[in-house]
């Protein structure tokens, strides 16, 4: 699984070496005599068989279709066929960012706590034998490190370590120089010891509604990664087909905490939805916090002081 291209949808950056490796490779070695074919289709083009003659950038090995390099016009569907085995990939080649040493779409980010040990290592197992040298860049400035085969950073984090780290592998193929880039975004935060989770906004919310209309009740909280946020309403949750809990959305704060929101959607509001409590709770090992929403008919608004209304 770690050695073949298992994903059916792949996005790559133009100008880099790239390969597709089918997942029945061990099988292919057993049946050397079997005809093995690679095809491409894109747009109006039907299956076109690929071979080194079809492009000087393409190389075919036992299990692998290599691109030297992959270009925008390589976007399309690729097929490997051998006897009754077929594997298909959809390849999307995106533009390189000409103004940076990396393309934002290809970045993976991690949070590191200040003073904690962290590391960056530059490795590429597939092209390992072809790599002449590897450089590590921070925010597109080359770092001077001893090892130019597998440059590594291992240290206790300081705030100045925050940034984009790009491993650039330089390799030769058929007399040409290529490079492959992998970029990591490191964010340094204060230590992430747990906070007491808190729901945002007033504890009691009267919401003015009209019968037959829909309403969305938004419950937001600041919480820890393992804390949960949920809605409680009525005798039995889920007994009203007009009430739907939407998928929880989470965004990480710069401090490594989470801002979560969960919407309760009430459709075709009826009398039974009025003047009852819809409770939103955030729960953690340190306790719970609850806020309540009450739906009030718009006509009855005059009976309630204005300051208790939410939009």
């Amino acid at each position: 699984a770690e050695s073949c291209t298992s994903r059916p949808h792949i996005t790559v950056v133009e100008g880099e070496p790239f390969y597709l490796k089918h997942c029945s490779c061990s099988l292919a070695h057993e049946i050397e005599t079997t005809t093995k074919s690679w095809y491409k289709s894109s747009g109006s083009q039907e299956h076109v068989e690929l071979n080194p003659r079809s492009s000087s950038r393409i190389a075919l090995h036992d299990c692998v279709l290599e691109f030297w390099p992959v270009e925008l016009n390589d976007t399309g569907s690729y097929f490997f066929q051998m006897k009754n085995y077929t594997q298909k990939w959809k390849l999307n080649v995106i533009r390189r960012n000409k103004h940076s040493c990396f393309t934002e779409r290809q970045v993976t980010s991690k949070i590191v706590e200040v003073k904690k040990f962290f590391q960056i290592t530059c490795e590429n197992s597939y092209y390992q034998t072809l790599v002449n040298s590897t450089s590590l860049y921070k925010n597109c400035k080359k770092l001077l490190l001893e090892n130019n085969k597998n440059p590594t950073i291992k240290k206790n984090a300081e705030f100045e370590d925050q940034g984009y780290y790009s491993c650039v592998h330089f390799l030769h193929h058929n007399g040409k120089l290529f490079n492959i880039t992998k970029t990591f975004n490191i964010t340094i935060v204060e230590d992430r010891s747990n906070i007491v989770p808190v729901l945002l906004g007033p504890k009691l919310n009267h919401v003015a509604v009209e019968l037959g209309k829909n309403v969305r009740l938004n419950c937001s909280a600041l919480l820890n990664e393992e804390d949960v946020i949920y809605w409680m309403f009525g005798e039995e949750n889920g007994s009203d087909p007009n009430i739907h809990e939407e998928k929880e959305m989470r965004i990480m704060t710069p401090e490594g905490k989470w801002h979560a929101s969960k919407v309760l959607r009430i459709e075709n509001i009826g009398e039974s939805n009025l003047n009852v409590l819809y409770n939103c709770t955030v729960a953690s090992t340190g306790g719970t916090d609850t806020k309540s929403f009450i739906l009030v008919r718009k006509a009855d608004m005059a009976d309630i002081p204005g300051h208790v209304f939410t939009r």
């Epitope: 699984a1 770690e2 050695s3 073949c4 291209t5 298992s6 994903r7 059916p8 949808h9 792949i10 996005t11 790559v12 390969y19 490796k21 290809q106 993976t108 980010s109 590391q119 290592t121 530059c122 490795e123 590429n124 197992s125 597939y126 992998k182 965004i251 990480m252």
Partner: nanobody, 120 residues
Framework: EVQLVESGGGLVQPGGSLRLSCAAS????????MGWYRQAPGGKCELVST????????YYADSVKGRFTISRDNSKNTLYLQMNSLRAEDTAVYYC?????????????WGQGTLVTVSS
Amino acid sequence: EVQLVESGGGLVQPGGSLRLSCAASGSTFDEYDMGWYRQAPGGKCELVSTISTIDASTYYADSVKGRFTISRDNSKNTLYLQMNSLRAEDTAVYYCEADDRGTWDRGGCWGQGTLVTVSS
């Protein structure tokens, strides 16, 4: 851009269990195959387990087969590694990684990770 945070490591006795979590944010979690790497003190970076986004098919290194279980909850944008029957040789820093190719060939031991120590 996907952002990953590992947690759940700790000290456990041989034979014990731990569950590691990796919370993802900032991008569509289900666009990525997810996996766990580990690096023992002074050792090399080793791919432990992966799970694909399309059919949730899994891979396990021989050293953890039958003891570790990888899973993902796309609704919570979270990856898990349930580790049972832990051994001293499982002691390592464990790193979560997202892969948009499915080739797992570019080394995943980076960041802070979460330390798992198996000792009596």
